[in-house]
Structures are given as structure tokens and as C-alpha cells.
């Protein structure tokens, strides 16, 4: 059953003399695999023996022997679906049917495959797109419907016989489908590729000729356009006249129409080759070009610049920057249409020549109040001097000058006064607006400028303004000299270092912080009582008779000041002890009688000491010694000593009588 | 090896019309630009125009224009150059040649 | 177009002579793509076709003799016979062909 047989392969294969086939092929025998085959060459059907004949170009039978001199032509396949073949190499007598005979278990079949070998290496196949269009990516393809495992070939791209530049990607097939080789070159042509020839060369592995294609591009591109002027330079003067011609160098397609453009616009009424312009005016200065269309779109020329030249027009100046300040720099440019360029120039301060000044632009580094005013300036080239122009103003912006602080008072100024200052200045630029003053305080700004301190303090020593524009500028600060009187009086003790005791040498000093005028005179005082003049009070053997509240005061022309009262206190050993007897020194037996230990002492007695007649002392160490009952042994001398941090006291002797009560005179 | 062979020559009428061949052999026909180019007597040689028989695509000088067409039979690998409108200025000889990569092939006019 | 203006209109010369003859592009015929100039030089011989001399400006075509030389580029371009023979006495033209084809005056 014949239809149980399948085959896939390319229809036609090609080669030439020497180079080899492959033939790609599947089969599917559905009854069983493959037990024989016989490839034969240009095969017929022999109806009386029902077998083919012709050439055998190979045969593998059940035992699977091959005949040795088989080896040309290759059966790569297998029993049951490969029936790749190979030959190699190839003969021009091999063109024909291959005819591949498959005998099954049951079934046979003859497949046929139509061979093409040529003499020489057939030329490969360059294909181009319908339009190739400049700067437009296309894609030129080469097809060699030719592949061979054992021969290998190249296939190379040629412009006008050189190599091209451009990478080409080169691809095989060797399929049941299709057997070819393809080059494919990306490129973008330009309008100069146009008319070119590309060449596709076939080559073998060694890079040897074997055959090629060859095209020459049609590449469309709008007109490509030389321009010519008349004068060559394209300078001209007012009054002359100018020729440009436009000459189309190359146009794919053919062109359609031709305009003229100045600076970018349309010139109308102009659409021939040739411009022609008539006694040209300075206006007619400008880029020109032609410009000319055909069906892919416009191509433009080079620009033409014409240049037509006229003495300088009116100048006028350009300042960088104004209002300018003080100390920075400014650059004055002098603008005037003119062609050719100035080559001189005359500058103008206020109406008067600036001498040296012949450039386009004046520069001052350092720009003063002075540089203010009206510049102005005049071009000058080959056909003539311009006019000045109305010129431009220069402000020259500058903080406030010579500030000064001005106090409006009588002088002196005396502590409490209310005080005036003014804040002058001699010019400013732009005007002052505000006034800044130092040290601030609560204090009243009647008018711009001025100051007013009520009730000026001692220690207002200094005062400053500042005249405020775009910047302050402060001026020198000003001495009020307020004079008061002295301040901080306090008494010092200058010696001893330590606390005062009985018998020392004492100074006081009359101290004070401050004084305007500085010329004072001093006074002690003690309880209302005027002890010196000087600004030191001495004492030379202190006793404590001189403790108390001093005072000193110390006066200048504005007035006196006094300190705070200071105690002295001296410190002395108790003394003038003492001992007094309560109720008396005659107490009756039984009674209650209180001695106490009598003192004056500074600091106060921190300890007392009793003793009796006999000197022996009592375990008594209060200031009072209390006998109570009293007996008559009591009766005796007593005598106490007192102790503080300076000393020791004692007393004279106090002699207690105690007499015996009427009870005991009664009962003896 | 390459060769054009023209047709022979001419003698027409003015306002006739006038069909010049050029038969091309030894390369591949569609492979290069078939040009047209006349000389009259005792003048220089002038382009009249060309045409790509791979595409029939083709090109004149603007002097020509509307009067010249430039024809190609791929069949027999001919190129046809037909001016019509003919004046007495138009006597010359006119020849097919063709570019190489760096040669040129001419018919003999 | 591209225009050719060759110099002199003709020349007389003697056999041995050197002999130069210019030709003038209204624009380049470089071509950038191959740095090659797309300028030939041919001879013509009354009642003949033009001969291919020189292409590439300065590429002498295979068989033609040695004493015929190119040489110039962009716009400018010079054809030399160094040593003058009697054979040599022709219309010389040259020939662009960068942008279609146009042919010097001769």
C-alpha cells in the first residue's frame, strides 16, 4: 500500500562540478523498518521484469555490506525515518532524478529527487527591497540556493569592488524544507550610493572567486544643490548687485520645483535657478540658500551669507550693569549695526572725549561716585563714522559717606540729663531711609536722624549711628562723657587680714568704683561724729572703745555719695569681771543665794570657772553659781574667770556672809 | 565577454521619431544600468539618460525630458532608446554603454 | 549637474613632449564611501567610440600604455602624456560619473 509511505525533502537540490550534496530526508514506512535500499541515478520502470533500471549509485542490503567504491555517495539515514544522503564530491554527470528505491518487510517504494549540478559555481541571488531611500535602514539579502556539510563557502559584500564596512549575518540551512546559504546586510545608504555597484561574491573556504551577483542601487534622494554666488565672497556695498545660482549636483527622482529662501523664509516670486539681485540694500544682508523639491522632498544648498556692507548706523550704549556700585566692575558696550565691524571707536564721558577709549567695549574695574553719568560713543569703518547715539545713564550706587554722630547738648552731660544726638552724613546713593543707632535702647527717635536719651545713665560711655541706603555705613562712635557722682562708696578693711583684736594696727579704706569728673574728696564719720579727710582711716593701738558704725562719703563736683554704715568690732579677753551676789551678799541660812560671773568680753565668755576662797575650783561652770539651800559653811571669797577664743579674766574676790537663821540661834 | 551590440544607423524626417537598440551579452542583463549617451559632429559627448533593467527604472538629463524614452526587454536582454520630435540638431551618433566596477563597456554607436 | 570644464580647447604638440591637460568639477566627486574619485579619461578617435584610458582619476584601465597618467582630487584634475607619440593625436574628454554621467568640452 503505497500510501503508507511518507517522504520530506527539498524538491530540486543544486550544485556544481566538485562541490558536494546533502540531502536532507525523513520517511516514515509504516509496516515495518527499512531492509532495503537502492539509490539509483535517472531510474525507469521496467514493465517486463517489474524492476528498475539505471545507475546505481548505492546499495545497502539485509547484511548491510556496502560495495567499496560506494563511497562518494553517503546514506546517512536509518531503518525507519532518516533517509539523509550524501555525495561528495559531486559531478556535473550526477544532474538528473535520484531515485531513492525502499524495500520494506512487504511494501516498496521510489521516491524521486531532481539533482541540478552546473558546470561552473552558479551565481547567488542579491535581493533588494522595492525602495531603497537615503538615510533609510534597508536590508540587501543574498541567496545561495546551495549548502554542503563538506564544502563550505562565503559569501562576501562588495561596493564599487571594495569590501563593505558593514557587518553582514550569514545564515544555512540544511533542511527537509529548504538547502541555502543567505548573507544579510544592514546598512543605511546615502544619496552618493546611488548608481553604485554592490556585488555579492561567492567563495569557497580559502576565499577563493567561484562566482558572484551584482546590482547597481537605485537609491531616491532629494536634489542635492550646490549654490554659486557672484561676487564669489558674497560681500557687496549698498547700491551693488548680486548673482546666485543653484546647480542640481543629483535628484532621484527628478525634481519638481525650485525656491529661494533668506534666512530661513521664502522669497516670493523666485523659483528659477538663478537669483538675481538689483541694487542691494543692507536689509538684503542674510543667509541665503536654494532650495529644491522632488517627489521623496526638499533638498536645501549651503547657506550663502550675504553681506552688504554700510557705514555704522547711530550707536547706541549698553551698560553692564546699572545702577552700578561703588568698587565693582561695569563694562560699557557700544553697539552699532555696521558692516564691515568697526574697527574704532570714540567714547564720550558726560559730553566729553574719554581719551585712550577705541575699543567696542570700556571696561572699569573699579567703578567710583565719579564714573556716574551720561556715556555715549561713535563707530567708525572702512565706508564711514556713524552718529553718536542718545547714550546711556550710569548710576554709580554707593553706601553713605562720612557718617558722623553729632550731640546737640551743652556739655558736660551730668547723669539724669536728657541727651540729643544727630546722625549726619555728606552724600548718599541711593538716599538714606533709615537710621541705625549703638548701643540699642529704649530710647525715642523723635525725627529720621535723631536720638533722644531721657535721663542718661552714668554709664552711657559711647554712641554710634548708622545712615542706612541699600547698606549702613556707621560712623565713629561718640563719647558722651557723662560725669556723675562717685559710685559703689564702700568701706575696706586693709588690715589685719584677720579679725580685729584688742591692740592692733587698723586701716580702713574709702573705696569706690568710679567717678567723672575724677577729682574727690573723702569724709569719715562714727555716730555723726567727722573723723578724717583722707581716703584711709588708721588706728594704731585699736581698742574696744573704737567699735562701731563707720561711714565714709566721698564727694566730687556733681556730688557726694556715702557708704553703707560698717561695724568694726574688736575682739578682746574678758575683762572687768565681777561677782555679783543675789539677793545680797548677806543671805540667811537656808536661803537661795545666786553668784554671777560679771563680764564684758567680745567675742561673749564661751566658758566660766568658779573658785572659792581656798582658790579651789568649784564643779560649777555656768555664769551663775546657784547655793541653795545655803549654808553657813558657804560663807567665804569668791572669785570667777571667764573664757573666750581671745582669753582669759579673772574677778577680785566677793566675800558671801551667811548668817545663821533666828531657828538655829533659837535652838542653841 | 561583455558586448553591445547597437542597431545601424538611421535617416529620418524632423518630427519623426526614432527607436535605437542595444542588444547586451557576456553579463548578466538586469545587473547594471543601461546608459544612453550621442555626440554630434564635432561636438562634445552628452548623457542623455539611463535606465535600471532590473527594475525598469529610469533617468534622463532635463534636456531631454518628454522627448526620450529609454526602454528594456529583460527577455532578450535589449535596451531601447526612442527620441521622438526630431530636429535637424538631433543628427549624431548615438551610443549604449554600460559602467564595470572599473571599466565601461560601449556600444559602437 | 556636475559641470566639467577641461583646458586647453586643443593643444599642438611634438612627439617626446609632455603634455598636460586639466579638468575642472563645479563639485567634488569624491566618493567617501570608497575614497575614490569618480573621474575617467578617454580618447576618441574620429568615427569612433571613446577608449577608456584612466578611471578612478588615476587608475590606468589594462592595456592602455604606461605614459598615460591621472592624477588630482575633489574638484581638480590633471591627465599627463609624459612622452608624446603620433598616435597620440586624439580628442581627449573627461568623464564623472559620482552622480550620473557628464563629460568635459573636449
Known amino acids: 500500500d503505497s500510501s503508507k509511505w511518507v517522504f520530506e525533502h527539498p524538491e530540486t537540490l543544486y550544485a556544481w562540478e566538485g562541490a558536494c550534496v546533502w540531502i536532507p530526508c525523513t520517511y516514515r514506512a509504516l509496516d515495518g523498518d527499512l531492509e532495503s535500499f537502492i539509490l539509483f541515478h535517472n531510474p525507469e520502470y521496467n514493465k517486463n521484469t517489474s524492476k528498475f533500471d539505471g545507475t546505481r549509485l548505492y546499495e545497502s542490503t539485509k547484511d548491510g555490506k556496502v560495495p567499496s567504491e560506494q563511497k562518494r555517495v553517503q546514506f546517512l539515514g536509518d531503518k525507519n525515518k532518516n533517509c539523509t544522503l550524501s555525495i561528495h564530491p559531486v559531478h556535473l554527470n550526477d544532474s538528473g532524478q535520484l531515485g531513492l528505491r525502499m524495500e520494506s518487510k512487504t511494501e516498496k517504494w521510489m521516491e524521486r529527487i531532481h539533482l541540478n549540478v552546473s558546470e561552473r559555481p552558479f551565481p547567488p541571488h542579491i535581493q533588494l527591497p522595492p525602495e531603497i531611500q537615503e538615510s533609510q535602514e534597508v536590508t540587501l539579502t543574498c541567496l545561495l540556493n546551495f549548502s554542503c556539510y563538506g564544502y563550505p563557502i562565503q559569501l562576501q559584500w562588495l561596493l564599487e569592488g571594495v569590501p563593505m564596512r558593514q557587518a553582514a549575518v550569514t545564515s544555512t540551512s540544511l533542511t527537509i524544507k529548504s538547502v541555502f546559504t543567505r548573507s544579510e546586510l544592514k546598512f543605511s545608504p546615502q544619496w552618493s550610493h546611488h548608481g553604485k555597484i554592490v556585488t555579492c561574491q561567492l567563495q569557497d573556504a580559502d576565499g577563493k572567486f567561484l562566482s558572484n551577483d551584482t546590482v547597481q542601487l537605485n537609491v531616491k534622494h532629494t536634489p542635492k544643490l550646490e549654490i554659486k554666488v557672484t561676487p564669489s565672497d558674497a560681500i557687496v556695498r549698498e547700491g551693488d548687485s548680486v548673482t546666485m545660482t543653484c546647480e542640481v549636483s543629483s535628484s532621484n527622482p527628478e525634481y519638481t520645483t525650485v525656491s529661494w529662501l533668506k534666512d530661513g523664509t521664502s522669497l516670493k516670486k523666485q523659483n528659477t535657478f538663478t537669483l538675481n539681485l538689483r541694487e542691494v540694500t543692507k536689509d538684503q544682508s542674510g543667509k541665503y540658500c536654494c532650495q529644491v523639491s522632488n517627489d521623496v522632498g526638499p533638498g536645501r544648498s549651503e547657506e550663502v551669507f550675504l553681506q552688504v556692507q554700510y557705514a555704522p548706523e547711530p550707536s547706541t550704549v549698553q551698560i553692564l550693569h546699572s545702577p552700578a556700585v561703588e568698587g565693582s566692575q561695569v563694562e560699557f558696550l557700544c553697539m552699532s549695526l555696521a558692516n564691515p565691524l568697526p574697527t574704532n571707536y570714540t567714547w564720550y564721558h558726560n559730553g566729553k572725549e574719554m581719551q585712550g577709549r577705541t575699543e567696542e567695549k570700556v571696561h572699569i574695574p573699579k567703578i567710583l561716585p565719579w564714573h556716574a553719568g551720561t556715556y555715549s560713543c561713535v563707530a567708525e569703518n572702512i565706508l564711514g563714522t556713524g552718529q553718536r547715539g542718545p547714550g546711556a545713564e550710569l548710576d554709580v550706587q554707593y553706601p553713605p559717606k562720612k557718617v558722623t554722630t553729632v550731640i546737640q547738648n551743652p556739655m558736660p552731660i551730668r547723669e539724669g540729663d536728657t541727651v540729643t544726638l544727630s546722625c549726619n552724613y555728606n552724600s548718599s546713593n541711593p538716599s538714606v531711609t533709615r537710621y541705625e543707632w549703638k548701643p540699642h535702647g529704649a530710647w525715642e527717635e523723635p525725627s529720621l536722624g535723631v536720638l533722644k536719651i531721657q535721663n542718661v545713665g552714668w554709664d552711657n560711655t559711647t554712641i554710634a549711628c548708622a545712615a542706612c541706603n541699600s547698606w549702613c555705613s556707621w560712623a565713629s562712635p561718640v563719647a558722651l562723657n557723662v560725669q556723675y557722682a562717685p559710685r559703689d562708696v564702700r568701706v575696706r578693711k586693709i588690715k589685719p587680714l584677720s579679725e580685729i583684736h584688742s591692740g592692733n594696727s587698723v586701716s580702713l579704706q574709702c573705696d569706690f568704683s568710679s567717678s567723672h569728673p575724677k577729682e574727690v574728696q573723702f569724709f569719715w564719720e562714727k555716730n555723726g561724729r567727722l573723723l578724717g579727710k583722707e581716703s584711709q582711716l588708721n588706728f594704731d593701738s585699736i581698742s574696744p572703745e573704737d567699735a562701731g558704725s563707720y561711714s565714709c562719703w566721698v564727694n566730687n563736683s556733681i556730688g557726694q555719695t556715702a557708704s553703707k554704715a560698717w561695724t568694726l568690732e574688736v575682739l578682746y579677753a574678758p575683762r572687768r569681771l565681777r561677782v555679783s551676789m543675789s539677793p545680797g551678799d548677806q543671805v540667811m541660812e537656808g536661803k537661795s543665794a545666786t553668784l554671777t560671773c560679771e563680764s564684758d568680753a567680745n567675742p561673749p565668755v564661751s566658758h566660766y570657772t568658779w573658785f572659792d576662797w581656798n582658790n579651789q575650783s568649784l564643779p560649777y561652770h555656768s555664769q551663775k553659781l546657784r547655793l541653795e539651800p545655803v549654808k553657813v559653811q558657804h560663807s567665804g571669797a569668791y572669785w570667777c574667770q571667764g573664757t573666750n577664743s581671745v582669753g582669759k579674766g579673772r574677778s577680785p574676790l566677793s566675800t558671801l556672809t551667811v548668817y545663821y537663821s533666828p531657828e538655829t540661834i533659837g535652838r542653841r | 565577454q561583455v558586448q553591445l551590440v547597437q542597431s545601424g544607423a538611421e535617416v529620418k524626417k524632423p518630427g519623426a521619431s526614432v527607436k535605437v537598440s542595444c542588444k547586451a551579452s557576456g553579463y548578466v542583463f538586469t545587473s547594471y544600468w543601461l546608459h544612453w549617451v550621442r555626440q554630434a559632429r564635432g561636438q562634445r559627448l552628452e548623457w542623455i539618460g539611463y535606465?535600471?533593467?532590473?527594475?525598469?527604472?529610469?533617468e534622463y538629463n532635463r534636456i531631454f525630458k518628454g522627448r526620450v524614452t529609454i526602454t528594456a526587454d529583460k527577455s532578450t536582454s535589449t535596451a531601447y532608446m526612442e527620441l521622438s520630435s526630431l530636429r535637424s540638431e538631433d543628427t549624431a551618433v548615438y551610443y549604449c554603454a554600460r559602467r564595470g566596477i572599473t571599466t565601461f563597456y560601449w556600444g559602437q554607436g | 549637474a556636475i559641470q566639467l570644464t577641461q583646458s586647453p580647447s586643443s593643444l599642438s604638440a611634438s612627439v617626446g613632449d609632455r603634455v598636460t591637460i586639466t579638468c575642472k568639477s563645479s563639485q567634488s566627486v569624491l566618493y567617501s564611501a570608497v575614497e575614490k574619485n569618480y573621474l575617467a579619461w578617454y580618447q576618441q578617435k574620429p568615427g569612433k567610440a571613446p577608449k577608456l584610458l584612466i578611471y578612478?582619476?588615476?587608475t590606468r584601465e589594462r592595456g592602455v600604455p604606461s605614459r598615460f597618467s591621472g592624477s588630482g582630487s575633489g574638484t581638480d584634475f590633471t591627465f599627463t602624456i609624459s612622452s608624446l607619440e603620433a598616435e597620440d593625436a586624439a580628442t581627449y574628454y573627461c568623464k564623472q560619473y559620482l552622480s550620473s554621467w557628464t563629460f568635459g568640452q573636449g
Open positions: 535606465i535600471n533593467p532590473r527594475n525598469d527604472y529610469t
Open positions: 578612478w582619476a588615476s
